[in-house]
């Protein structure tokens, strides 16, 4: 995608496919032909790794091989030889260089003295045509150190310790075509240092400490085609014609410097420049006429700079441009007509740019565009005429579906059904468990309501996935910015937070009663209701604050298709990031730690009291039941929250987290608690089991009575629900004695154990 990649990857070339260009088959907007057959397929099915056409046509020519590589591959064919183990072409010809240092290798007229601890340029026969002195200890290049090598064509000096180069160091190298000085410590190049290098075509000075260059630096380089100054410390380019002494310069690579701005005169003499790479600099300002002289420019790479504003007509003279990279710039706004003049553009990279005013009008004039790259795959909908649009998924959604994975599309319904049904069932069953402990029941119903919201959230996501099925991309941007998405996202957070806070509250109540039985004060109705109200209010506040301040939180819930703010992106506002961390690694992590600690302490406390009990075997059995129950409560909490904490923590450390993680977390991990809470806190408890048992017993009785024609009297289910203090000695079963689990503290220590089975 970038020009630099030409250096490191051998490109595969092919014909380029532009919308409708040169094809007999005409397809409607957003559709592209399957080669020479009449079938047309939508954008999202082209270049997706699947043979949808049936003749591979939709997967042909998908590589983005635009840019200089197409025209100038011949200049790079030998670059790869240089990076191989030996820079020699023939297999193993005999050495034709008369005198060769013992530690060097020689084949034909080419000499390889790599990694031989040389401290100076060796003296060899003058007929040498290539000399590789890489990875040595050369510190300086004195005058005339290459004077006799009139036939030398390639000189490799990478990875030495060169700090100074004499102005006459390269004198006599009249045949030199390629000079590599990368990975040294060069701070300055004296004007005229390259004066004798009239045939030099490549000059590569990557990874040095050059802080300034001026036109006279390159005096004598009339044949230079490629100049690579990557990864130096250049802060500015001269306000004079840079290419004054390099009239044939085609490729200028200034990636990874510290250049702040580009001046109007810099490129005035660079009329033959075909590729200009300026990525990873600190460019913050561009003048309207900066690129005006570059009328032959084929590739312009300005990615990863600090550009905030693009002058409206900055690209107006770049009629030949086929590849433009503006990725990862803090560009505030792109003009609707910004790209109008780029009629030959084939590849446009806008990754990492939030295009708030995105519209089809921006890309419509780019009729030859075959590849486009955005920050969000949702933007692809605004360039329907471009065959290859990336990204085509954010890991959650794809161009076709809100939920990219078929597993997720199915399970969103399964999990939401289980969650809703389980919780509604418990809510409905509560009146039948006529507990004296109304306050505890109220807390459980509250928990079920919160968990039910998670089921509703998943139902809504599933519903919109169905609604957008097959054409999600058309609606993606609008959906993520919609009120529906904001509300459904806040519903998920409300559910999560209320559930977490309620579980913490219930756990702390039990903890105090079990661990400090004699300090246990019976919580009044008023206090319990107050706590429940406070928990719900807190949940609402946490969930709805991001909706109240768009400026601060941006589109907090709409960062992905499932509207759940799990991990922050780099471009998300700092406020949103802090807020998200405060929820997940603040409130929720603290709650999780409290729950784990409380259950651990409770079990320890019960275990300690059980040691004094006499019926050892019975106690061990009960202890195991208790341990099992506690383990499942803590385990499901851990199962739900540990992955979320890990994801959040990693995103905080700026570890790249695949988008797929969010959807799997939302559909399979986040609802674990919501789905299992009714089972853990109600459906598996003894009161519930007994109630079911009595229902069943009563039903059987009634049947047998009916068959005998007798009237049935159902027993009233009046018993004390004290989950998790369920097993009571009959003599203590008095309604007035237990109105809350706390009061169990009056029971002897050994009885405490019974109460948890």
């Amino acid at each position: 995608m970038t020009s630099g990649s030409v250096f490191f990857y051998i490109l595969i070339f092919g014909k380029y496919f532009s919308h409708g260009g040169g094809q007999d088959v005409k397809c409607s907007l957003g559709y592209f032909p399957c080669g020479n057959i009449t079938k047309c397929l939508p954008q999202l099915l082209h270049c997706n790794g699947v043979d949808d056409c049936g003749n591979q046509a939709d997967e042909d020519n998908c590589g983005d091989n635009n840019g200089w590589s197409l025209q100038f591959d011949k200049y790079f064919a030998s670059y790869y030889k240089m990076t191989s183990q030996y820079p020699f072409e023939a297999e193993t010809p005999e050495c034709l260089v008369g005198s060769v240092p013992v530690q060097c290798l020689c084949q034909g007229l080419e000499l390889d003295c790599d990694e031989t601890n040389l401290r100076a340029v060796p003296s060899v026969s003058s007929n040498v045509t290539a000399m590789s002195l890489q990875w040595n200890l050369i510190r300086k290049l004195p005058p005339d150190c290459f004077k006799n090598y009139h036939d030398l064509q390639k000189l490799y000096l990478q990875n030495n310790k060169i700090t100074s180069i004499s102005i006459y160091a390269f004198r006599g190298l009249n045949s030199l075509t390629k000079l590599y000085l990368s990975h040294n410590r060069i701070t300055f190049l004296k004007p005229g240092v390259f004066e004798d290098l009239h045939r030099l075509e490549w000059l590569i000075i990557e990874d040095n400490h050059l802080s300034r260059i001026s036109p006279p630096t390159f005096y004598g380089l009339n044949s230079l085609i490629l100049l690579v100054l990557m990864n130096n410390v250049l802060t500015r380019l001269p306000d004079k014609p840079l290419c004054q002494h390099m009239p044939r310069l085609h490729w200028l690579d200034l990636e990874g410097n510290h250049i702040h701005n580009l001046r109007n005169l810099t490129f005035i003499s660079c009329s033959n420049l075909t590729v200009l790479v300026m990525r990873k600099n600190k460019i913050n300002h561009l003048n309207e006429n900066t690129f005006a002289p570059l009328q032959k420019l084929d590739e312009l790479d300005l990615g990863s700079n600090k550009i905030e504003n693009l002058p409206p007509l900055i690209f107006k003279d770049l009629k030949e441009l086929s590849q433009l990279n503006l990725s990862y710039n803090p560009i505030q706004k792109i003009q609707a007509n910004q790209f109008d003049y780029l009629v030959k553009l084939k590849s446009l990279s806008l990754e990492g740019i939030e295009i708030s005013n995105i519209q089809q009008r921006m890309f419509r004039p780019l009729m030859n565009l075959s590849h486009i790259y955005f920050k969000k795959f949702q933007y692809c909908g605004y360039a329907p005429h471009v065959r290859s649009c990336k990204p085509n998924t954010d890991g959650i959604s794809s161009l076709e579906n809100l939920l990219a994975s078929i597993i997720q599309r199915v399970f969103v319904w399964v999990v939401s059904a289980v969650t809703c049904f389980g919780n509604i069932f418990v809510i409905c069953m509560r009146p039948y468990i006529r507990s004296e402990n109304k306050l505890y029941a109220m807390s459980i119903i509250s928990l079920c309501c919160a968990d039910c919201l998670m089921g509703i959230y998943l139902f809504v996501i599933g519903g919109f996935d169905l609604k957008f099925r097959g054409e999600y991309n058309k609606h993606a941007q609008l959906w993520m910015e919609s009120t529906h998405c904001q509300l459904v996202g806040s519903l998920a957070i409300l559910s999560t937070e209320v559930s977490v806070l309620l579980l913490t509250f219930l756990t702390l109540e039990k903890y105090i009663c079990i661990v400090y039985p004699f300090r246990c004060v019976r919580p009044g109705k008023c206090r319990t209701i107050t706590v429940l109200i406070l928990i719900w209010i807190t949940g609402f506040i946490v969930a709805f604050i991001p909706l109240s301040n768009k400026e601060f939180f941006k589109n907090y819930y709409g960062t992905n298709g499932v509207c759940f703010p799990l991990h922050s992106e780099d471009t998300e506002s700092i406020g949103a990031q802090i807020y998200s961390v405060a929820i997940f690694l603040g409130i929720n992590l603290a709650a999780f730690i409290i729950i784990v600690f409380s259950y651990g302490s409770m079990f320890y406390s019960v275990h300690q009291s059980a040691i004094t009990a006499t019926e050892i075997r019975n106690q061990v059995k009960k202890e195991m039941i208790l341990a099992k129950r506690f383990f499942f409560i803590v385990f499901t909490d851990a199962l739900c929250w540990i992955p979320i904490f890990v994801v959040k923590f990693l995103s905080l450390l700026q570890v790249e987290i695949p988008g797929t993680i969010t959807s799997w977390v939302v559909i399979f991990i986040l609802p674990i608690n919501s789905a299992l809470n009714p089972i853990l806190y109600t459906l598996t408890t003894r009161p519930f089991k007994e109630m079911i048992h009595r229902f069943w017993y009563n039903y059987r009785q009634r049947k047998s009575m009916d068959s005998k024609g007798q009237k049935t009297y159902a027993p009233s289910f009046i018993w004390v629900e004290m989950w998790p203090l369920q097993e009571m000695p009959p003599e203590l079963m008095k309604p007035d004695l237990f109105t809350y689990p706390c009061e169990m503290s009056l029971i002897s220590q050994s009885t405490r154990l019974n109460s948890y089975s």
Partner: antibody
Amino acid sequence: QIQLKESGPVVIKPSQSLSLTCIVSGFSITSSRFCWNWIRQPPGKGLEWMGRICYEGSRYYSPSIKSRSTISRDTSLNKIFFQLNSVTSEDTAMYYCSREKQIAGTGFDYWGQGTTLTVSS
Amino acid sequence: DIVMTQSHKFMSTSVGDRVSITCKASQDVSTAVAWYQQKPGQSPKLLIYSSSYRYTGVPDRFTGSGSGTDFTFTISSVQSEDLAVYYCQQHYSTPLTFGAGTKLELK
């Protein structure tokens, strides 16, 4: 233990070609940064370097015999070969093969016991 | 080509004597000089490499010195088994060259 063993004809006629073999045992001839040399010593005279082949296959010859000599190798058999064309009585000598670490100044650390050649009509 | 000149073809010595053999290079070879010992009917043996480094197993009575163009090989106390021909060799650049040899014999 590294051993080098030269073999070849004892007597050949002038103008014929000489073929010598050096079998290396206990060490790979393709080991990085090692070269394998042929050196000869005419009766009662000093040592003369004839040429070398290095680990990656590069070959170097003494200018005095360059036009009529060829060094080659068989990496699978771990053998070094030396061929000298159009021999004369001047080529009567003891022929040695030796190993050299490809670092300036290290010299020839292992030698074969040598093979004697007499050129006679 | 670099020419290595050993000024003495023969050197007479007695057991226990100190003897020095010199070698001169026609151009700068830094310290890339090796010394060999050859006894009648045997292959040469490496004694000294890189001008002054003793090869493994070589007795410490054998020493070498020098750099640039002038090199010296010394036997601090000659033993009867040291009677042999000694060659210097430049191991700096191809073609590799030897000195003509110095024969050490008893007085």
